[in-house]
């Protein structure tokens, strides 16, 4: 080491480099000091003056130490899309990062250039590799026995709830729906046990595999709003059997309304001497199709006295959507004086036994030609344990409906045009058919 | 059903390589991550890395960075191990699966073994 | 690199008894995005996937078996064990783009 310190400017001994924070000036041929972060060189050094240095600009800065004669300028504003997670100040440069929900598509030296949003997993689909600042999501179908019903860019596939008794299997894309006995839950605490609504949003992935084809059933099992998310069972408290009385009950009531109407109009009745049917249909049938398990049950001329009844049917097949499509078969396809529900059956497990559950609800509505109204609800139900699933029920197994039907006859109407209707459009009116089993 | 199906043992000398095969059948290869993990006699698992076979991307551990190659060929849905500059510590059973925190889909190969011996 | 550890190394139990297996984070606290992970491993059986995600059971394994976690730990508990229960029990923590499995811990009967 040198007996003194040498100042700048200085000439350095040969073969020696300049010291730290020092650089070595080709013009001068001397050790100069340079300039700090946030300065640049405003003058550079001679022989016998060091080099002089002025603070950088706004929008511009430096880093490092030191000898360039204009400060750098910061990088552009970042985007909509970004977020400032360094400001440009005299001695350091704007970063831009993308903000919550994107990655980074195109990297610079220091944060990024192009952010993009991280792909979103649909219905069926689950995050297989979660999104990193530089990576986008990857997402794949849920496995069997999971499923996701969210459109996100976080959430993975989840088990199904484990049922006593399965009312609708979980598939893809939904959990399983228990019967009122409790579940077993596959999940955590605190997680949510009834199928969410789904978006739709569109994906960068495949189609989503076909769901199972249980058809769910219509009104019985209403999926109404979500549970709370905390200690709930994720099932349907009120039994079965209550939900029928109440459905029966309702469409009693709405016939009485019917035939006071119709005897306040001097409607004479046809009073058809036939007997409905309806087979029980293998589930890959019964998926969302209107096939011959729905019968024709109740014909009104079109006047005010069908809007109830119209509008309560309605709102049964609105509560409870099917699996395959946005909403159940419903009165919207039916003419003004029809109202409609579907029957389904549910498909137990492979092998296992099913207990099915045949619930008929008719109303017959009948008014005699003295104007005294004779009102007769008859509900058919059949109940029992079967040792197949629903949708290998005998082909000749039928469900009497109801050994009377009764139509209003309008002025417009003759007893040969509305026998002739019979087998045109398909009227059901809340026939649930459900089959509930155990898992 | 489904079924992962390796390749059978193979011996090797240090500083060889060896590419371990495992035939997934039973569902569509691209649906799921194929993972790669190894057990070294009387010892605890050791993740390789993953492939998503239906783009070929993989994620290796650290360790594996630089000696391992993953790839899938999904035309025969086989998936593919190549572990490069082998070392007496690399003996071990290799295993192939499906089976990660993410998806669910639980299947393993039968494993095969691997041994580095001069 | 991360580390998981897993404790204890064995744990002695009787058929019936609770058994509480951990599995620690080296780098910090385990978060959701660490999908804790823990497979059975029994001898000359293949592996068998029981906890995953966000502590769910995968479909098929019975209720006996639940994961939890808090802090740096990540838990698997068994309420009460049934003589198949009797194995090797492996953690695997999610770390960004990679699986750490943990050291595994030896559940043995008493």
């Known amino acids: 080491l040198p007996a003194q310190v040498a100042f700048t400017p200085y000439a350095p001994e040969p073969g020696s480099t300049c010291r730290l924070r020092e650089y070595y000036d080709q013009t001068a041929q001397m050790c100069c000091s340079k300039c700090s972060p946030g300065q640049h060189a405003k003058v550079f050094c001679t022989k016998t003056s060091d080099t002089v240095c002025d603070s950088c600009e706004d929008s511009t800065y430096t880093q490092l130490w030191n000898w360039v004669p204009e400060c750098l300028s910061c990088g552009s504003r970042c985007s909509s899309d970004q977020v400032e997670t360094q400001a440009c100040t005299r001695e350091q440069n704007r970063i831009c990062t993308c903000r919550p929900g994107w990655y980074c598509a195109l990297s610079k030296q220091e944060g990024c250039r192009l952010c993009a949003p991280l792909r979103k997993c649909r219905p069926g689909f689950g995050v297989a590799r979660p999104g990193t600042e530089t990576s986008d999501v990857v997402c794949k179908p849920c496995a069997p026995g999971t499923f996701s019903n969210t459109t996100s860019s976080t959430d993975i596939c989840r088990p199904h709830q484990i049922c006593n008794v399965v009312a609708i299997p979980g598939n893809a894309s939904m959990d399983a729906v228990c019967t009122s006995t409790s579940p077993t839950r596959s999940m955590a605490p605190g997680a949510v046990h009834l199928p969410q609504p789904v978006s739709t949003r569109s994906q960068h992935t495949q189609p989503t595999p076909e769901p199972s084809t249980a058809p769910s059933t219509s009104f019985l099992l209403p999926m109404g709003p979500s549970p709370p998310a905390e200690g709930s069972t994720g099932d349907f408290a009120l039994p079965v059997g209550l939900i029928v009385g109440v459905t029966a009950l309702g469409l009693l009531i709405i016939g009485v309304v019917n035939c006071v109407i119709m005897t306040q109009v001097k409607k004479k009745p046809l009073c058809l001497q036939r007997e409905a049917k309806v087979p029980h249909l293998p589930a890959d049938k019964a998926r969302g199709t209107q096939g011959p398990e729905q019968q024709h049950l109740l014909i009104t001329a079109p006047s005010s006295s069908s809007s109830s009844l119209e509008s309560s049917a309605s709102a049964l097949d609105r509560r409870a959507p099917t699996r395959n499509q946005p909403q159940a078969p419903g009165v919207e396809a039916s003419g003004a004086g029809e109202a409609r529900a579907s029957t389904g059956s549910s498909d137990s497990s492979p092998g296992g036994h099913g207990t099915q559950v045949n619930v008929t609800c008719i109303v017959n509505v009948c008014s005699s030609s003295d104007h005294s109204s004779q009102c007769s609800s008859q509900a058919s139900s059949t109940m029992g344990d079967t040792d197949s699933s629903p949708s290998e029920s005998p082909k000749d197994e039928q469900v009497p409906f109801s050994k009377e039907e009764c139509a209003f006859r309008s002025q417009l109407e003759t007893p040969e045009t509305l026998l002739g209707s019979t087998e045109e459009k398909p009227l059901p009116l809340g026939v649930p058919d459900a089959g509930m089993k155990p898992s | 059903q489904v079924q992962l199906v390796q390749s059978g043992a193979e011996v090797k000398k240090p500083g060889a390589s060896v590419k371990v095969s495992c035939k997934a059948s039973g569902y569509t290869i691209t649906d799921f991550y194929i993972h790669w993990v190894r057990q070294a006699p009387g010892q605890g698992l050791e993740w390789i890395g993953r492939?998503?076979?239906?783009?070929?991307?993989?994620e290796y551990a650290p360790n594996f960075q630089d000696r391992a190659t993953m790839t899938t060929d999904t035309s025969t849905s086989t998936a593919y191990l190549e572990l490069s500059s082998l070392r007496s510590e690399d003996t071990a059973v290799y295993y192939c699966s499906t089976w990660d925190g993410f998806s669910y889909f639980d299947y393993w190969g039968q494993g095969t073994t691997v041994t580095v011996s001069s | 690199e991360a580390v998981v550890t897993q404790s204890p190394a064995t744990l002695s139990l009787s058929p019936g008894e609770r058994a509480t297996l951990s599995c620690r984070s080296s780098t910090g606290p385990v978060t959701t995005n660490n999908y804790a992970n823990w497979v059975q491993q029994k001898p000359g059986q293949a592996f068998r996937g029981l906890i995953g995600?966000?502590?769910d059971r995968a479909p098929g394994i019975p209720a006996r078996f639940s994961g939890s976690g808090s802090g740096t730990d990540t838990t698997l508990t068994i309420s009460s064990l049934q003589p198949e229960d009797f194995a090797v029990y492996y953690c695997?923590?999610?770390?960004?783009?990679?699986?750490?499995f943990g050291g595994g811990t030896k559940l043995e009967i008493k």
């Open positions: 695997a923590l999610w770390y960004r783009n990679h699986w750490v």
């Open positions: 995600g966000t502590n």
């Open positions: 492939v998503d076979p239906e783009d070929g991307n993989t």
